[in-house]
């Protein structure tokens, strides 16, 4: 059975290099991939009742997400 990539990292693994334009950070395997391969978040409509999702980085620090809410260039999800 293949082990998941998350099994290979330590809890204190360094943050990855930010993704180049047109790439997004895959939070599962923790590397940059073409944004089209991921379900990057859609923007919340103005005045939506639910709060916008929290991000660990400020928007200007997020890279490679394209339109809408930025995909996070950090290892942190799964």
């Amino acid at each position: 059975m293949r082990r998941g990539p998350r099994s290979l990292r330590g809890r204190d693994a360094p943050a990855p290099t930010p993704c180049v334009p047109a790439e997004c950070f895959d939070l599962l395997v923790r590397h940059c991939v073409a944004c089209g391969l991921l379900r990057t978040p859609r923007p919340k409509p103005a005045g939506a009742s639910s709060p916008a999702p929290r991000t660990a980085l400020q928007p200007q620090e997020s890279v490679g997400a394209g339109a809408g809410e930025a995909a996070l260039p950090l290892p942190g999800l799964l």
Epitope: R2, G4, R6, S7, R11, A15, L27, L28, V29, V33, G36, L37, L38, R39, T40, P41, P51, P53, R54, A56, A71, L74, P75, G76, L77, L78
Partner: antibody, heavy 117, light 111 residues
């Protein structure tokens, strides 16, 4: 909106095999992460495994390599092959799609697998 | 594996009540300042429905009476004013470490 439809459940004898299908519409299975989750009668949820955009798979180690996830991109369908089935594998099997943050936001209706002699 | 323990296992409440369900992880599910905890609602014979992701983010289309909070090992799902359609079973799930694991569920019943 993603829609998922499972099929292939039914009655199988202990030691037998079964292949479940999950047909996806509204998005390509070459994008994102596609999961199987199961629920034994009257019990809680158990994550089975996933296949992602590149065809990479990962499984819950508790299943001890008896289960295999695969896909057919031409049919936009992914599968759960279950071998050496046991009575304790009796469950409703759901397929589900992850959002960017790893939560399962789209689910199929479920298909019941009964392992009994 | 990270063990998820929900409490209570079941509860009886009335329409309009404020309901709180807790979920405790056997170890922290935080990483890089994010809590990898999600909450689902399931009704009999139906698939689960995502309510809250990343501990406190409300899924699109979910009523604002649902909210989530917590970090580290202790998390809470709150229903501010219980509605008839909220009687169901609720599950927490962590996706911080493989294998992903769910709590045993909390059944919310009519008093």
């Amino acid at each position: 909106e993603v829609q998922l439809v499972e099929s292939g459940g039914g009655l199988v004898q202990p030691g037998g095999s079964l292949r479940l299908s999950c047909a996806a519409s509204g998005d390509s299975i070459t994008r994102g992460y596609w999961n199987w989750v199961r629920q034994a009668p009257g019990k809680g949820l158990e994550w089975v495994g996933y296949i992602n955009y590149s065809g990479t798979t990962y499984y819950n180690p508790s299943l001890k390599s008896r289960f295999t996830i695969s896909r057919d991109t031409s049919k936009n369908t992914f599968y759960l092959q279950m071998n050496s089935l046991r009575a304790e594998d009796t469950a409703v099997y759901y397929c589900a799609n992850l959002n960017y943050y790893g939560a399962m936001d789209y689910w199929g209706q479920g298909t019941l697998v009964t392992v009994s002699s | 594996d990270i063990q998820m323990t929900q409490s209570p296992s079941s509860l009886s409440a009335s329409v309009g009540d404020r309901v709180t369900i807790t979920c405790r992880a056997s170890e922290s599910v935080d990483d890089y300042g994010i809590s990898f905890m999600h909450w689902y609602q399931q009704k009999p014979g139906k698939a689960p429905k995502l309510l809250i992701y990343r501990a406190s983010d409300l899924e699109s289309g979910v009523p604002s009476r649902f909210s989530g909070s917590g970090s580290g090992t202790d998390f809470t799902l709150t229903i501010s004013s219980l509605q008839p359609e909220d009687f169901a079973t609720y599950y927490c799930q962590q996706t911080s470490k493989d294998p992903w694991t769910f709590g045993q569920g909390t059944k919310v019943e009519i008093k």
